[in-house]
């Protein structure tokens, strides 16, 4: 008898090379094989559970950056006046959550913020839990 | 044929709002659906394997905090003279281990230490390994 | 009917107590039960997917340390002029990758670098994806 295979784990890696002040970062998924989707510049959460979250990037100017998942809830990450980020976190997310950036900068620059090595990874840690598609 | 489902992953999120000097932090599990259990202020390990461990909190006074898993072994985390923690680690734990806090403070205060956003998450990384219940 | 079990997750913990200048760190796997293998001082990657990577150690002298996975690609970790490391990261690795150290030190010492608590852990996060053995 063939041993059971794992159904694919919900995970995604998105890249971002540009962020807009008082808006967010423009995210793109380089792979078509991702098991999670990007919609309206947000990562859509279909499955309840803990997620491992990795966030990296070098920014062209000092900024304050937050990563949100639900209106009215505190951010998953919040970094104030940084020019780079290399953080890992764990958070409980649920169906209908959307993971998105908010960025603010206080410089007089009129350029969008350039990002080098901008990468956000989400990996579901509780396969077998509730999912809705 | 229905594709195989994942059995639930061993994971737990506990919260703590108070720590006692020369003792530990009073942990509570806000969800009844957790796949791991709290007993005598410790998280009980039933399954061998690597665990992803996330520890967060803001403390009302400076303290030294350690997170232990087995008598005679070094701590999973050890923080000296801090007022906050936001750490992630990976450790190999095994059946019969118990994860618990030890806290010391050098202030003359007779109050328990208050904790804001105190959260400890454990997520098993090796489903399919040995478990005993 | 017996519920399906998880096939073993690809994971490994290696230890290192010694690093050689302009070479790497001598890694050994303390357990014979590991699901990943060490070959020519490198950890062999058989399965595509995200990996959780934990790196720890205290060094006998200041060094610059990088952890590589593929020729011509940037490092998974890069630490400059440190005497200790305690880092966690997430990276996408693929079949045929090999995870190995590179170490440089600027001291005049002719001794190998001694390492206390040197530990590297890799845990595959996408079971169910492509593997080749």
């Amino acid at each position: 008898q063939v041993p059971p295979q794992y159904p694919p784990i919900q995970s995604i890696r998105v890249q971002f090379t540009r962020c807009e002040n008082e808006k967010g970062c423009i995210i793109t998924s380089p792979s078509k094989d991702e098991t999670m989707k990007v919609q309206d510049n947000s990562i859509i959460i279909n499955c309840d559970g803990f997620y491992l979250i990795s966030l990296k990037g070098y920014f062209s100017e000092e900024l304050s950056l937050s990563l949100y998942y639900r209106k009215g809830r505190g951010p998953l990450f919040s970094l104030s006046k940084v020019t780079s980020v290399d953080s890992i976190g764990v958070a409980y997310l649920a169906f209908k959550d959307k993971v998105y950036f908010n960025v603010t900068t206080h410089s007089t620059s009129y350029k969008d913020i350039q990002v080098n090595g901008g990468e956000l990874i989400l990996i579901h840690q509780n396969p077998g839990g509730f999912c809705a598609y | 044929q229905v594709p195989p489902q994942y059995p639930p992953i061993q994971s737990i999120r506990v919260q703590f709002t108070r720590c006692e000097n020369e003792k530990g932090c009073i942990i509570t599990s806000p969800s009844k659906d957790e796949t791991m259990k709290v007993q005598d202020n410790s998280i009980i390990i039933n399954c061998d394997g690597f665990y992803l461990i996330s520890l967060k909190g803001y403390f009302s006074e400076e303290l030294s905090l350690s997170l232990y898993y087995r008598k005679g072994r070094g701590p999973l985390f050890s923080l000296s003279k801090v007022t906050s923690v936001d750490s992630i680690g990976v450790a190999y734990l095994a059946f019969k281990d118990k994860v618990y806090f030890n806290v010391t403070t050098h202030s003359t205060s007779y109050k328990d230490i208050q904790v804001n956003g105190g959260e400890l998450i454990l997520i098993h990384q090796n489903p399919g390994g040995f478990c005993a219940y | 009917q017996v519920p399906p079990q998880y096939p073993p997750i690809q994971s490994i913990r290696v230890q290192f107590t010694r690093c050689e200048n302009e070479k790497g760190c001598i890694i050994t796997s303390p357990s014979k039960d590991e699901t990943m293998k060490v070959q020519d001082n490198s950890i062999i990657i058989n399965c595509d997917g995200f990996y959780l990577i934990s790196l720890k150690g205290y060094f006998s002298e200041e060094l610059s340390l990088s952890l590589y996975y593929r020729k011509g690609r940037g490092p998974l970790f890069s630490l400059s002029k440190v005497t200790s490391v305690d880092s966690i990261g997430v990276a996408y690795l693929a079949f045929k990758d090999k995870v190995y150290f590179n170490v440089t030190t600027h001291s005049t010492s002719y001794k190998d670098i001694q390492v206390n608590g040197g530990e590297l852990i890799l845990i595959h996060q996408n079971p169910g994806g492509f593997c080749a053995y």
């Epitope: 062209s60 007089t108 620059s109 350029k111 350039q114 | - | -």
Partner: antibody, heavy 121, light 112 residues
Framework: EVQLVESGGDLVKPAGSLRLSCVAS????????MSWVRQAPEKGLQLVAG????????YYSDAVKGRFTISRDNAKNTVYLQMNSLRAEDTAIYYC??????????????WGQGTLVTVSS | DIVMTQTPPSLSVSPRETASISCKAS???????????LDWYLQKPGQSPQLLIY???NRFTGVSDRFSGSGSGTEFTLRISRVEANDTGVYYC?????????FGQGTELEIK
């Protein structure tokens, strides 16, 4: 091939208004900051206003602050300069310029042909 | 604002000779990101300006290798070797390290 084509320049009376347009082609418009640079007769070059690729950030020189408004329509690949309360000293050729896309600083790698604005009674 | 001062204001050079234009900034143009945002532009008669050199010494696409930029900090030079009739026009330096972007007052190059 990158092209920037300005229009809207005219003769206008002091305190009057004018709207300049610049239609861009040959590059991903929304990814680049755009600027208006002017050159008064027999004078040098002066940055007047700039706007980020996404349109959320703007810059104005002190000389035009509160009178001029820069905007963009990324769907139409067009950047605008609304000029109000015009003064004689605003007389100049107005160039639309594309940012070079450098990491943090600025330069202008492509320029339009310019449009002449004359403020006179 | 950073003031950019160009010398000389005008320059007359024979064909095939080398022309040099100097540009001085009132403060260092070294950005916190490690780059120096100093550019050189040429405005030919009746035309709009065109970028020649960016980041102090990098030739823009399609620019002849007869044009070279050098310098650091506050002092910069544009050299045009083997000058041709087509090089006639006004040369401007400009800095983009700090807003506002500011230009030098220009150097007019005439070919004898």
């Amino acid at each position: 091939e990158v092209q920037l084509v300005e229009s809207g320049g005219d003769l206008v009376k002091p305190a009057g208004s004018l709207r300049l347009s610049c239609v861009a082609s040959g590059f991903t418009f929304s990814s680049y900051s755009m600027s208006w640079v002017r050159q008064a007769p027999e004078k040098g070059l002066q940055l007047v206003a700039g706007i980020s690729g996404g349109g959320s950030r703007t810059y104005y020189s002190d000389a035009v602050k509160g009178r001029f408004t820069i905007s963009r329509d990324n769907a139409k690949n067009t950047v605008y300069l609304q000029m109000n309360s015009l003064r004689a000293e605003d007389t100049a050729i107005y160039y639309c310029a594309k940012d070079g896309g450098s990491w943090a600083g600025y330069n202008f790698d492509y320029w339009g042909q310019g449009t002449l604005v004359t403020v006179s009674s | 604002d950073i003031v950019m001062t160009q010398t000389p204001p005008s320059l007359s050079v024979s064909p095939r000779e080398t022309a040099s234009i100097s540009c001085k900034a009132s403060q260092s143009l070294l950005h916190s990101d490690g780059s120096t945002y100093l550019d050189w532009y040429l405005q030919k008669p009746g035309q709009s300006p065109q970028l020649l050199i960016y980041l102090g010494s990098n030739r823009f696409t399609g620019v002849s290798d007869r044009f070279s930029g050098s310098g650091s900090g506050t002092e910069f030079t544009l050299r045009i070797s083997r000058v041709e009739a087509n090089d006639t026009g006004v040369y401007y330096c400009g800095q983009g390290t700090q807003l506002p972007y500011t230009f030098g007052q220009g150097t007019e190059l005439e070919i004898k």
